[in-house]
Interface confidence: low
């Protein structure tokens, strides 16, 4: 029998330019008679134009929903009912070509053409895009709160906030032709549930979404987004009811920035410069294309690209790259945002140089990408260290910590976390190196102790970048570096004179003068440690809840011992800045560290002084007994302690702890405690210091209380943020 043809709805969205009409402000108000009258005429014209072509057979409906500058631009959508088998034949490009052909055929015609009765439509200004029924529904839901804004060159326009009676609003933004729009979003509240979506076209077309942001993001308090051209739409969806705008939006037109560079690198190792997407740190725009050509001075060198929170991965099955496509020496790689550092190492085999291309393959974009570039020695990429092939980074080898995700930096070690004697490859513990006592057969542990040595895992790097063999030489009263830098910044780590209770668990005043109590509305929440005159370090997870993210909530107490009373040595501070480690990941507890800048510098006293910070190479030997302090609960699930408690814990080898916690322990973590449990940190101790005493009598910060299974349970150690794993970030912030 006869089978009726299956018809499908195909939705198109677009804009056209009218040359004999001019835009006026009346046309931005949907309730105005000017808008109603212009819409009726434009609607009629659009329908007549479509039905004048062979698309007329399929015409279903259409709507002009907005106007803009140019002299007058009409924004519209229409639906065609198409036989299913012809669906692919009527792509937006084909439909646009048919309509343009129709317009061109009547440009010089003297015959009366219905759609030309009122309007002179510019064939070159017609744009047709693919849309969906869902897109039209999304558009219609915003029309009760629709704002059109034109922003001129050199202007920065602050957009009027949303209408709080509406559940959704749309800002339709337009700038001068040949420029691109840059939108700035700044979240102004600590907590909200609002959603904002930015599109690379005039309306909310899902396929042209640039990015969407949600709920007063603390990770990105300010977001700058670039469109590929002079048109953009921003859609707001209401979260919790609020009379205050949780965000500020502003927009400005900017010129296209070329993203092409030819560079010749110098004959030296390490970073030599930075490449970045246009307007970094703005999100890169759809249709970004960067091409960087780098020439290497000799085939001895390879090219290294160091990324921050971004990695390159091979993409399977030729799927599009959703976070940026890279081509490097004909290899196609996809960008991937990660909470880790990463390096791409490119072996150089020809003097012609290397071309690196970056392209945004889809309209969905992301934070701008910045990469440091430099050279590495192809025959020895990581002098004194191990090249981790998984992430391209140089990591310490054989230090007892699997820094490389595949653990190969700890494989095939003759001496793990110990010193290897030259004579017979016996291993001696690191504190025995350069201690004045020969321990190796021919005394190789005491050689080269007064001179510079090649830098390695356990060598200390002086300020002049030379290295010394003696482990942990900082602040021991003897200058080991030629420039004396190992004895600088040593006003730290000394306890105040205290009448300590021998063997007692309660600390006395001045015993731990770096200990901080971080409080919200008079309630102790977390511990912390003073590390500089205006900086306290703590755990990032203390600020995990949105309600705890605002600096105004927090008060920092130093010199405190008892929670329920004050004594003269105690001082308090407000917080002027709160910085979480950029790689902090709540789920895994990785990089669990935060820095608080105090509102004024501390005045040092017997009860208030900073702890010493270790160098990256500082070795805290497993088995060493160290101390944790805090006002945390005295038993699992119990209330916090009134008195500052102290407890000794033993540092645990990383592999043992990793096994116990089923490999959830990262290189930025350190474990301490006892197999039998009992001595441990607990709730309320978070962020507090784990300190170890050096032979010099100074206390060094080894860790911050981070996480663990329960408190003091047998077989489960406490897990601490490893300070040596995050020290470079700390120093970068504090200095």
């Amino acid at each position: 029998g006869y089978k009726a043809e299956v018809m499908v709805s195909q939705v198109y969205s677009g804009s056209l330019r009218v040359l004999n009409r001019h835009f006026s402000q009346d046309l931005t108000r949907r309730e105005s008679s000017a808008f109603r009258s212009e819409t009726a005429k434009a609607q009629k014209m659009l329908k007549e134009l479509i039905t004048s072509t062979r698309l007329g057979t399929y015409y279903n409906s259409s709507s002009v929903y907005s106007f803009g500058e140019g002299p007058l631009t009409c924004f519209f959508w229409f639906i065609l009912q198409i036989p299913e088998h012809r669906r692919l034949m009527l792509s937006p490009e084909v439909v646009q070509a048919l309509l343009v052909e129709e317009l061109l055929s009547t440009v010089n015609s003297s015959a009366a053409v219905p759609y030309r009765a009122e309007y002179e439509v510019d064939p070159e200004g017609l744009v047709i895009l693919e849309a969906s029924v869902k897109d039209i529904a999304a558009l219609n839901s915003t029309l009760g709160c629709y704002r059109y804004s034109y922003v001129g060159q050199g202007q920065v326009l602050r957009l009027k906030g949303p209408d709080h009676l509406a559940s959704s609003c749309l800002w339709h933004l337009q700038g001068p032709k040949d420029l691109m729009l840059k939108l700035r979003l700044e979240w102004t509240l600590a907590e909200c549930r609002d959603r904002l979506a930015m599109y690379d076209v005039a309306g909310p077309l899902e396929k042209r979404l640039i990015t969407s942001v949600y709920g007063c993001s603390r990770q990105e308090p300010v977001v700058e987004v670039l469109a590929s051209g002079a048109i953009m739409a921003v859609v707001w969806k209401k979260g919790l009811h609020s009379y205050y705008d949780p965000f500020v939006l502003s927009v400005q037109p900017v010129v296209f920035q070329a993203c092409e560079v030819n560079l010749t690198l110098d004959n030296r190792l390490d970073s030599q410069g930075v490449l970045s997407t246009p307007y970094f740190p703005s999100y890169y725009s759809p249709q970004t294309h960067c091409s960087w050509h780098l020439t290497v001075p000799s085939l001895d060198y390879g090219l290294a690209l160091w990324f921050d929170a971004y990695a390159l991965r091979r993409q399977k099955y030729d799927l599009p790259c959703t976070q940026g496509q890279w081509t490097i020496q004909n290899r196609r790689l996809c960008g991937l945002r990660i909470l880790q550092p990463y390096a791409e190492r490119i072996p150089v085999v020809a003097t012609a140089g290397i071309t690196i291309n970056f392209t945004s393959q889809i309209s969905l974009t992301g934070p701008g990408v910045r990469v440091h570039y430099g050279l590495y020695n192809q025959s020895d990429p990581c002098p004194g260290e191990f090249l981790c092939s998984v992430n391209g980074l140089c990591v310490p080898a054989c230090d007892g910590v699997k820094d490389c995700p595949n653990g190969l930096d700890e494989r095939n070690c003759v001496c793990r976390a110990t010193f290897q004697c030259k004579e017979d490859s016996t291993c001696i513990s690191l504190p025995k190196v350069c201690d004045g006592q020969p321990d190796c057969l021919n005394g190789s542990d005491e050689e080269q102790c007064q001179e510079g040595v090649p830098c390695g895992t356990f060598t200390f790097q002086c300020e002049d970048r030379s290295c010394v063999k003696k482990p942990n030489p900082q602040c021991d009263g003897r200058p080991d570096c030629r420039d004396g830098s190992d004895e600088e910044h040593c006003d730290c780590g000394l306890q105040g004179p205290s009448s300590r209770i021998v063997g007692g668990a309660v600390s006395s005043e001045g015993e731990w003068p770096w200990q901080a109590s971080l409080q919200v509305r008079g309630r102790h929440i977390c511990g912390g440690a003073l590390i500089a005159d205006r900086w306290v370090i703590t755990a990032a997870h203390c600020f995990q809840e949105d309600s705890m993210a605002s600096t105004v909530l927090w008060t920092v107490f130093l010199g405190k011992v008892w929670q329920n009373s004050r004594w003269p040595g105690e001082v308090s501070f407000k917080v002027s800045r709160l910085l979480l480690h950029p790689y902090h990941e709540e789920d895994s507890h990785d990089y669990d560290v935060a820095l608080l800048q105090l509102d004024h510098p501390v005045v040092r006293s017997a009860a208030v002084r900073p702890v010493c910070l270790p160098a990256r190479s500082h070795f805290f030997e497993p088995g060493l007994h160290c101390w944790i302090t805090g006002w945390g609960a005295l038993r699992e699930g119990g209330p916090i302690s009134n008195a500052l408690q102290k407890v000794d814990v033993q540092l645990i080898p990383q592999d043992l702890c990793s096994e116990v916690y089923r490999y959830q322990v990262t290189p930025r973590m350190l474990c301490a405690g006892y197999r039998k449990g009992k001595k441990d940190a607990c709730q309320g101790d978070s962020g507090g210091p784990l300190v170890c005493k050096a032979l010099s009598g100074r206390w060094f910060l080894a860790g911050l209380v981070s996480w663990g299974l329960g408190c003091g349970r047998p077989n489960y150690f406490g897990v601490y943020t490893r300070i040596t794993g995050v020290i470079s970030w700390i120093q970068q912030v504090v200095t």
């Epitope: 998984v390 699997k402 995700p405 595949n406 095939n412 990793s658 096994e659 116990v660």
Partner: antibody
């Protein structure tokens, strides 16, 4: 309830190829390394290969290196073992096993699939 | 010939205690954790002990593991007929870059 189900076993002639599959359910597949372990009839266990949770690395026992390829499709919760140039001594029950990330603790095993290489 | 050496069989009366040994070298047991697996007749292996002495949830505390130097052992107390099975030790071997198993020990409950 974690379940691993192997399939693809059978009788095959020496020199030919076979592809084994293992489908996981009740588990966050992407968080774990996956291994193949085999057991020759009436004999002990022999580890064959591992693939890291994120597909970044795979290792093989010397006896299968260059002939077998382990792969996974995290979107399908599936693990595969492509076996080429099969030999009579590859005859075994092949088990897929879930490994703790970066470790070799096999906490869940499939029921096994028998591969017989015979002319 | 297995890299890790286990006795081929052991037997003991019900309610008694039995120990199964597993001997290796510095490149496997000496440097890495040992895991034990139980394989009941006609079934797939099951994890019994991980990391030398850790008991996975759901495994009876009649089973215990220990390690000293390059040897490990599995002890089963209060023997039951349901414990009749093959027991395998396993460890990573640094020089082979592979997981190595013992040849297996058949436990008979008399």
């Amino acid at each position: 309830q974690v379940q691993l189900v192997e399939s693809g076993g059978g009788v095959v002639q020496p020199g030919r190829s076979l592809r084994l599959s293992c489908t996981a359910s009740g588990v966050t597949f992407t968080n774990f390394d996956m291994h193949w372990v085999r057991q020759t009839p009436g004999k002990g266990l022999e580890w064959v290969a591992v693939i890291w949770y994120d597909e970044s690395y795979s290792y093989y026992a010397d006896s299968v290196q260059g002939r077998f390829t382990i792969s996974r499709d995290n979107s399908k919760n599936s693990l595969y073992l492509q076996m080429n140039s099969l030999r009579a001594d590859d005859t075994a029950v092949y088990y897929c096993a879930r490994g703790w990330t970066g470790s070799y603790v096999f906490d869940y095993w499939g029921q096994g699939t028998l591969v017989t290489v015979s002319s | 010939q297995s890299v890790l050496t286990q006795p081929p069989s052991v037997s003991e009366a019900p309610r008694q205690r039995v120990t199964i040994s597993c001997s290796g070298s510095s490149s496997n047991i000496g440097n890495n954790a040992v895991n034990w697996y139980q394989q009941l007749p006609g079934k797939a292996p099951k994890l019994l002990i991980s990391y030398d002495d850790l008991l996975p949830s759901g495994v009876s505390d009649r089973f215990s593991g220990s390690k000293s130097g390059t040897s490990a052992s599995l002890a089963i107390s209060g023997l039951q007929s349901a414990d009749e099975a093959d027991y395998y030790c396993a460890a990573w071997d640094d020089s082979l870059n592979a997981v190595v198993f013992g040849g297996g020990t058949k436990l008979t409950v008399l």
